[in-house]
Interface confidence: medium
């Protein structure tokens, strides 16, 4: 008789999850010499230990501490790029601007990017059928708690000038409920961070509005200012040209507004 299994509202663990995490770890440590010392088997064991045999609605940041310790990594604190609802462009940017880093350019972010995982209480099985949805089921699920933990640590490490890329095509350009809005903004350290620079990315070709005047951006400015961090905002009207100009800054067309 098949054992009863909790049915959650979200998709189940990504196929071949253990193999994917292990393979990504090996690949990352090969590409990044400063992380060559990392034992990927230990990383997988710590990752697995954070959620296996635990109720997937009762995961804590504490569960991930062994993994955090193994994945400790120093990125230049003044070269951090945060993003909200515009991951692809942020990653394209750091692929070109190699001295800047998103969370997914770090080992732990790279391991988990686009993956889903959860276990079951009191069994060592991984649940490939369904996992808790943040809204419909519970917020303390393995994936949400992981991203909250690594995002908080990433924001806490930032210094000097921190950049954030925001999606100007969305109704809420700055969303207080996003990871950026709910975690990262509140964990930037005013003693270390002088300024948050927001880059608002425009979607439409003919969109010449100043989206830095958007009410949600003003809300972000207010939150940041109250935390005694300076705030600046820039419209990126042509993201394609923006990337092109990052690649080829000498291009004569790159002197005009992008």
């Amino acid at each position: 008789v098949p054992r009863w299994r909790q049915q959650w509202s979200g998709p189940g663990t990504t196929k071949r999850f253990p193999e994917t995490v292990l393979a990504r770890c090996v690949k990352y440590t090969e590409i990044h010499p400063e992380m060559r010392h990392v034992d990927c088997q230990s990383v997988w064991d710590a990752f697995k230990g954070a959620f296996i045999s635990k109720h997937p609605c009762n995961i804590t940041e504490e569960d991930y501490q062994p993994l955090m310790k193994l994945g400790t990594q120093t990125v230049p604190c003044n070269k951090i790029l945060l993003w909200s609802r515009i991951k692809d462009l942020a990653h394209q940017f750091t692929q070109v601007q190699r001295d800047m880093f998103t969370l997914e350019d770090t080992l732990l972010g790279y391991l988990a990017d686009d993956l889903t995982w959860c276990g079951e209480f009191n069994t060592s099985k991984i649940n490939y059928q369904s996992c808790p949805d943040w809204r419909k089921d519970c917020s303390n699920n393995p994936v949400s708690v992981f991203w909250k933990t690594v995002s908080r640590r990433f924001a806490e490490a930032a210094c000097d000038v921190v950049h954030v890329m925001l999606n100007g095509s969305r109704s809420k350009i700055f969303d207080k409920n996003s990871t950026f809005g709910s975690v990262e903004v509140h964990n930037l350290q005013p003693e270390k961070v002088q300024t948050l620079e927001a880059w608002v990315i425009h979607g439409g070709r003919e969109d010449s509005r100043d989206l830095c005047q958007d009410p949600t951006i003003k809300e972000l400015e207010s939150i940041i200012s109250k935390r005694n961090i300076q705030f600046s905002c820039k419209n990126i009207y042509r993201p394609d040209k923006f990337l092109q100009c990052v690649k080829n800054p000498e291009d004569s067309s790159c002197t005009s507004e992008i």
Partner: antibody, heavy 119, light 111 residues
Framework: QVQLLESGGGLVQPGGSLKLSCVAS????????MNWVRQAPGKGLEWIGK????????NYTPSVKDKFFISRDNAKNTLYLQMTKVRSEDTALYYC????????????WGQGTTLTVSS | EIVMTQSPASLSASLGQRATISCRAS??????????VHWYQQKSGQPPKLLIY???NLESGVPARFSGSGSGTDFTLTIHPVESEDVATYYC?????????FGSGTKLEIK
């Protein structure tokens, strides 16, 4: 409206000490980094240092490090500059300033108070 | 520390003409999107007054005849047309990192 009012300047002998004060009004003092800037007679501006809202972080220009000490009392809306081991080159007009520059409209300076170092 | 070298030390301009003041930083004071250079005007016996912030943004209440430009290490303050009330000393200032520093100042006179 925002006001910054410095006091405590005067004549001090070389090697002596003096504490300057700056009382802030018209804004929530406890939210802002505050700065001291000085200007020697007939000379340019020199940034001395700044203090974070909760006093946990202080930065100084190298020439005054270990000699000048910035502090604040948020309950009294007051910024301080304790000057020790003063020399003739410390003779200047001392400004208290809120140098918050990112979105405009946040920049405020006091009128200054004068320190004269002479024997 | 980043040294801000300002030129000229003094400048004589005719009313209605253009006055240009330069400031060069010993290291870049810009990031991918912004330049942390600001311009102040100081009239005799008064504290400095912010004119331009982040290289090119006009502080509210400042006349549009003042403008700023530049990025990286080279910055310019332009006054056009010059008016009699513009007689003052002008300073560039960077807040890219600590210690903040100021340029040595440019004294503007009217011919």
């Amino acid at each position: 409206q925002v006001q910054l009012l410095e006091s405590g300047g005067g004549l001090v002998q070389p090697g002596g000490s003096l504490k300057l004060s700056c009382v802030a009004s018209g804004f929530d003092f406890s939210l802002y980094w505050m700065n001291w800037v000085r200007q020697a007679p007939g000379k340019g501006l020199e940034w001395i240092g700044k203090i974070s809202p909760d006093s946990s972080s202080l930065n100084y220009t190298p020439s005054v490090k270990d000699k000048f000490f910035i502090s604040r009392d948020n309950a009294k809306n007051t910024l301080y500059l304790q000057m020790t081991k003063v020399r003739s080159e410390d003779t200047a007009l001392y400004y208290c300033a809120r140098l918050w520059i990112a979105t405009g409209g946040y920049n405020y300076w006091g009128q200054g108070t004068t320190l004269t170092v002479s024997s | 520390e980043i040294v801000m070298t300002q030129s000229p030390a003094s400048l004589s301009a005719s009313l209605g003409q253009r006055a240009t003041i330069s400031c060069r930083a010993s290291n870049s004071v810009s990031t991918s999107a912004f330049s942390y250079v600001h311009w102040y005007q100081q009239k005799s016996g008064q504290p400095p007054k912010l004119l331009i912030y982040l290289a090119s943004n006009l502080e509210s209440g400042v006349p549009a005849r003042f403008s700023g430009s530049g990025s990286g290490t080279d910055f310019t303050l332009t006054i056009h047309p010059v008016e009699s009330e513009d007689v003052a000393t002008y300073y560039c200032h960077h807040s890219r990192e600590v210690p903040f520093t100021f340029g040595s100042g440019t004294k503007l006179e009217i011919k």
